[in-house]
């Protein structure tokens, strides 16, 4: 009788292990579906916007090579500008080359004229080094022309053809950047 109970208990335990495995597999499957659905949704949105715009960038964004740029229509301080970009799945503009700088300044001239636009550049308070938001250093030709006299945190902005610096708490327009979606055509 005791042996019979022991056998039943073992069978129940085996069944429980199988159910746990099944549940784990289901959880993984569900996660996989969620991921696929996210990609699928992004692909559908891209396909729809491409059908309407023939563009790998969202509406009101400008494309140059692999990047999409958004020039804000509102002013904000540097930190809020960064958050506004993140809401759109982008970051403040990181200028990688003189070619990109020329494209940006040329586009700004056409759109708005000579205003101030925050970019993703800030000065480390301890070392005084300029760094882009991903932690990389700007190339020598892309360092702000003037050192701000502010005792507060200092951030970089674009005006006309120049990269300048200012107290991060001042209000300016801003430029967001994200990767352009590649066309599969």
């Amino acid at each position: 009788k005791l042996l019979q109970v022991s056998t039943i208990a073992m069978q129940q335990q085996e069944k429980l292990i199988q159910q746990e495995r099944a549940l784990l597999n289901f959880t993984e499957w569900k996660r996989s579906c969620a991921l696929q659905m996210k990609y699928c949704q992004a692909f559908m949105q891209n396909s729809l916007s491409s059908a309407h715009n023939s563009s790998p960038c969202p509406n009101n964004w400008i494309q140059n090579r692999e990047s999409c740029y958004y020039v804000s229509e509102i002013w904000s301080i540097w930190h809020t500008s960064q958050e506004n970009c993140l809401k759109e799945g982008s970051t403040l503009l990181q200028i990688e080359s003189k070619e990109e700088m020329d494209f940006i300044t040329g586009s700004l001239r056409k759109i708005k004229g000579s205003y101030d636009y925050w970019v993703g550049l800030s000065q480390d308070g301890h070392s005084g080094r300029w760094l882009w938001q991903d932690g990389s250093s700007p190339s020598p030709g892309l360092l702000p022309a003037e050192r701000s006299q502010s005792a507060n945190q200092v951030c970089g902005y674009v005006k006309s053809n120049s990269l300048l610096s200012s107290n991060c708490s001042t209000w300016k327009y801003f430029i967001c950047e994200k990767y352009a979606l590649r066309s599969s055509v």
């Epitope: 969620a34 659905m37 996210k38 949704q41 992004a42 958050e83 993140l86 809401k87 759109e88 799945g89 982008s90 970051t91 938001q133 991903d134 932690g135 950047e177 994200k178 990767y179």
Partner: nanobody
Framework: QVQLQESGGGLVQPGESLRLSCAAS????????MGWYRQAPGKQRELVAA???????TYADSVKGRFTISTDNAGNTVYLQMDSLRPEDTAVYYC?????????WGQGTQVTVSS
């Protein structure tokens, strides 16, 4: 709605490491970026690091070179690897999901760096 659950906080000594995790659930398709914020007693909540759905990363000046933000393959868990921790990193760390509409916050996890 998006739900966020942080974990991984604790008490460590200066120079040690800690890894925070934030799992997102619910309407994760609406998330465009995820970030970590921190708030020390008597101070404002500040952005520490963020990562967009395209993989672009952003860091606060004070953590550049020490902290690394990343996500899992599914994109619904974000991690903050914190190395070379300093006493000034002591704070409650909050996870935030950025969407075009609302922003969603986690409950927070305490990180204390003390010898």
């Amino acid at each position: 709605q998006v739900q966020l659950q942080e974990s991984g906080g604790g008490l460590v000594q200066p120079g040690e490491s800690l890894r925070l995790s934030c799992a997102a659930s619910g309407s994760i398709f609406s998330i465009n970026a995820m970030g970590w914020y921190r708030q020390a007693p008597g101070k404002q909540r500040e952005l520490v690091a963020a990562i967009t759905d395209g993989g672009a990363k952003t860091y606060a000046d004070s953590v550049k070179g020490r902290f690394t933000i990343s996500t899992d393959n599914a994109g619904n868990t974000v991690y903050l690897q914190m190395d070379s921790l300093r006493p000034e990193d002591t704070a409650v760390y909050y996870c935030k999901a950025f969407t075009r509409g609302n922003d969603y916050w986690g409950q927070g996890t305490q990180v204390t760096v003390s010898s």
